[in-house]
C-alpha cells in the first residue's frame, strides 16, 4: 500500500499535534495517532495486545474507506471478502469464493459458471457460428473438369467460442457428393483448383447428401437465442485486460 503511517510519539499529552509524525494530526504515546491530517484515513492496527491508531493515504486490503466531515476511517470488509467497495459490496473475494454482483459465493448461481482465472461468476457463453459460405465448385482431386462425380464443400466461421459450460460448436465444414456433365479439360484448365473458380448455381442433378467433416464434428447442440451482446463482451475484455494487470480494488 502507498501508506504514510503516523508513528507513535514519546509525548505525555494525548492531544497535542506538534511532534506527530507522518499523517497524524493529533497523537499520544500510548495510542499512536488519534486523528489524521486532511484526506488521510484513520485505521486501528493491532500490535500485540493493544491497538494503535495509524494514518494512511489509502485503506489496506480487507478494508474500505469512508469519508465523514470530521474523520476518514477504514472499516473491515466482510469475512469472505478480500477488498470491498463498502460494507455491502465486495470487489475481490478471499480464496475459494467467487464474486457475483458484489457478493462472495462458494458456488455460482444456476445459469452462471465459475471463472477460475478472475474468480467470478460469469454468464455461460455458447458457441456462435456464421451463416454457411456458398458451396465450392464441384471438384475431384483438385480439378473441376475431366470427371463425372466429385465433391463440393462449404464452410462457416466460429464467431464466438463457447465457455466451459457453453454449448459446443456445430460442424464448421460440410462436404457432399456432386455430379457434373463430363467435360474434357481445356488446355489452360488442366489441374485448376476448384477454389479458383466461383460457381454461380448448383449443378443440375447433383447429390444433396451432405457429409459433415469429421475434423469439425465437435457437437451439434443448438445455439440458444440468449447470448451476451457484443458490447458486453467488449467491456468484459476491457475489464479482464485491466484485471490481469492486477486485480481491481477500490480504495
Amino acid at each position: 500500500q502507498n501508506a504514510s503511517r503516523g508513528r507513535r510519539q514519546r509525548r505525555m499529552h494525548p492531544n497535542v499535534s506538534q511532534g506527530c509524525q507522518g499523517g497524524c494530526a493529533t497523537c499520544s504515546d500510548y495510542n499512536g495517532c488519534l486523528s489524521c491530517k486532511p484526506r488521510l484515513f484513520f485505521a486501528l492496527e493491532r500490535i500485540g495486545m493493544k491497538q494503535i491508531g495509524v494514518c494512511l493515504s489509502s485503506c489496506p486490503s480487507g478494508y474500505y474507506g469512508t469519508r465523514y466531515p470530521d474523520i476518514n476511517k477504514c472499516t473491515k470488509c466482510k469475512a469472505d471478502c478480500d477488498t470491498c467497495f463498502n460494507k455491502n459490496f465486495c470487489t475481490k473475494c478471499k480464496s475459494g469464493f467467487y464474486l457475483h454482483l458484489g457478493k462472495c459465493l462458494d458456488n455460482c448461481p444456476e445459469g452462471l459458471e465459475a471463472n477460475n482465472h478472475t474468480m467470478e461468476c460469469v454468464s455461460i457463453v455458447h458457441c456462435e457460428v456464421s451463416e454457411w459460405n456458398p458451396w465450392s465448385p464441384c471438384t475431384k482431386k483438385g480439378k473441376t473438369c475431366g470427371f463425372k462425380r466429385g465433391t463440393e464443400t462449404r464452410v462457416r466461421e466460429i464467431i464466438q467460442h463457447p465457455s466451459a459450460k457453453g454449448n459446443l460448436c456445430p460442424p464448421t465444414n460440410e462436404t457432399r457428393k456432386c455430379t457434373v456433365q463430363r467435360k474434357k479439360c481445356q488446355k489452360g484448365e488442366r489441374g485448376k483448383k476448384g477454389r479458383e473458380r466461383k460457381r454461380k448455381k448448383p449443378n443440375k442433378g447433383e447429390s444433396k447428401e451432405a457429409i459433415p467433416d469429421s475434423k469439425s464434428l465437435e457437437s451439434s447442440k443448438e445455439i440458444p437465442e440468449q447470448r451476451e451482446n457484443k458490447q458486453q463482451q467488449k467491456k468484459r475484455k476491457v475489464q479482464d485486460k485491466q484485471k490481469s494487470v492486477s486485480v481491481s480494488t477500490v480504495h
Epitope: 457478493k103 494487470v245 492486477s246 486485480v247 481491481s248
Partner: antibody, heavy 123, light 111 residues
Framework: QVQLQQSGAELVRPGVSVKISCKGS????????IHWVKQSHAKSLEWIGV????????SYNQKFKGKATMTVDKSSSTAYMELARLTSEDSAIYYC????????????????WGAGTSVTVSS | DIVLTQSPASLTVSLGQRATISCRAS??????????MHWYQQKPGQPPKLLIY???NLESGVPARFSGSGSRTDFTLTIDPVEADDAATYYC?????????FGGGTKLEIK
C-alpha cells in the same frame, strides 16, 4: 433494444412519500444493477444509490439514507425508489440508470439511462 | 467524498475546431491498474448518455471524434472536430470510491 422506462411526473405535497418505478426491457434484467440519480438545478447530478436486481442488495449514498429506499421486483423486471418525507429540496428529476455489466461495483458506471421522472414538491 | 472539479464551466468552440474539457479529482481514481473515470453527454430535456468509460474506452455507437485520457486525478475529454450536434453539457463521474460522484458539468456551445 435496451430500455429503461420510468413512471410519470409527480406533483406532491410536502411531508408525503412518493414511489417511482423503472422497468427494464431488451436485456436480462437480473444480470445488471440499477442506480438512481438525482438531478436538480442546485446540485447538478447526485448518485443516490445502487441495487443489485439479482439479490436485491442495496447500497446508499450516506446523504440519501433515510430519504430513499430502493427495491426491486424481478418478476416484472422493475426497480422502485421510494422518497420519504418530501420537502422542496427533493424537487428534482430522478433518473434510473443501468450499471454496466460486471461483478465489481467499480465497473457499474451508468451505461443506459431512463428518461427521468420529475418530482415537484409543492403545497 | 471524492470531489470532481470540471473546467471550464462553459466553453464556446467554432465548428470543426477542437474542444477540450478538464476534470480534476480531489483523490486518485486509479486502483491497481484500473481508472474508474467516465464521461457523459447531456442535451436539454434528455437523460445523460455514456460517451467514455474507464477513462479512455469509447462507448459503442459514439463517434470517434470523442476521446478520453488521463489517470489518477487529471482527466480530459476531447472532441475533435466539433460538430453542431455536440452542443450539450458534459459530466465526468468516478466510481473508484463510495459514494459515486459527478463533476459539476461543462456546457459546450458551438459557434
Amino acid at each position: 433494444q435496451v430500455q429503461l422506462q420510468q413512471s410519470g411526473a409527480e406533483l406532491v405535497r410536502p411531508g408525503v412519500s412518493v414511489k417511482i418505478s423503472c422497468k427494464g426491457s431488451g436485456y436480462t434484467f437480473t444480470d445488471y444493477v440499477i442506480h438512481w440519480v438525482k438531478q436538480s438545478h442546485a446540485k447538478s447530478l447526485e448518485w443516490i444509490g445502487v441495487i443489485t436486481t439479482y439479490y436485491g442488495d442495496a447500497s446508499y449514498n450516506q446523504k440519501f439514507k433515510g430519504k430513499a429506499t430502493m427495491t426491486v421486483d424481478k418478476s416484472s423486471s422493475t426497480a422502485y425508489m421510494e422518497l420519504a418525507r418530501l420537502t422542496s429540496e427533493d424537487s428534482a428529476i430522478y433518473y434510473c440508470a443501468r450499471g454496466a455489466y460486471g461483478n465489481s461495483p467499480s465497473y457499474w458506471y451508468f451505461d443506459v439511462w431512463g428518461a427521468g421522472t420529475s418530482v415537484t414538491v409543492s403545497s | 467524498d471524492i470531489v470532481l472539479t470540471q473546467s471550464p464551466a462553459s466553453l464556446t468552440v467554432s465548428l470543426g475546431q477542437r474542444a477540450t474539457i478538464s476534470c480534476r479529482a480531489s483523490e486518485s481514481v486509479d486502483s491497481y491498474g484500473n481508472t474508474f473515470m467516465h464521461w457523459y453527454q447531456q442535451k436539454p430535456g434528455q437523460p445523460p448518455k455514456l460517451l467514455i468509460y474507464l477513462a479512455s474506452n469509447l462507448e459503442s455507437g459514439v463517434p470517434a471524434r470523442f476521446s478520453g485520457s488521463g489517470s489518477r486525478t487529471d482527466f480530459t475529454l476531447t472532441i475533435d472536430p466539433v460538430e453542431a450536434d455536440d452542443a450539450a453539457t458534459y459530466y465526468c463521474q468516478q466510481n473508484n470510491e463510495d459514494p459515486y460522484t459527478f463533476g459539476g458539468g461543462t456546457k459546450l456551445e458551438i459557434k
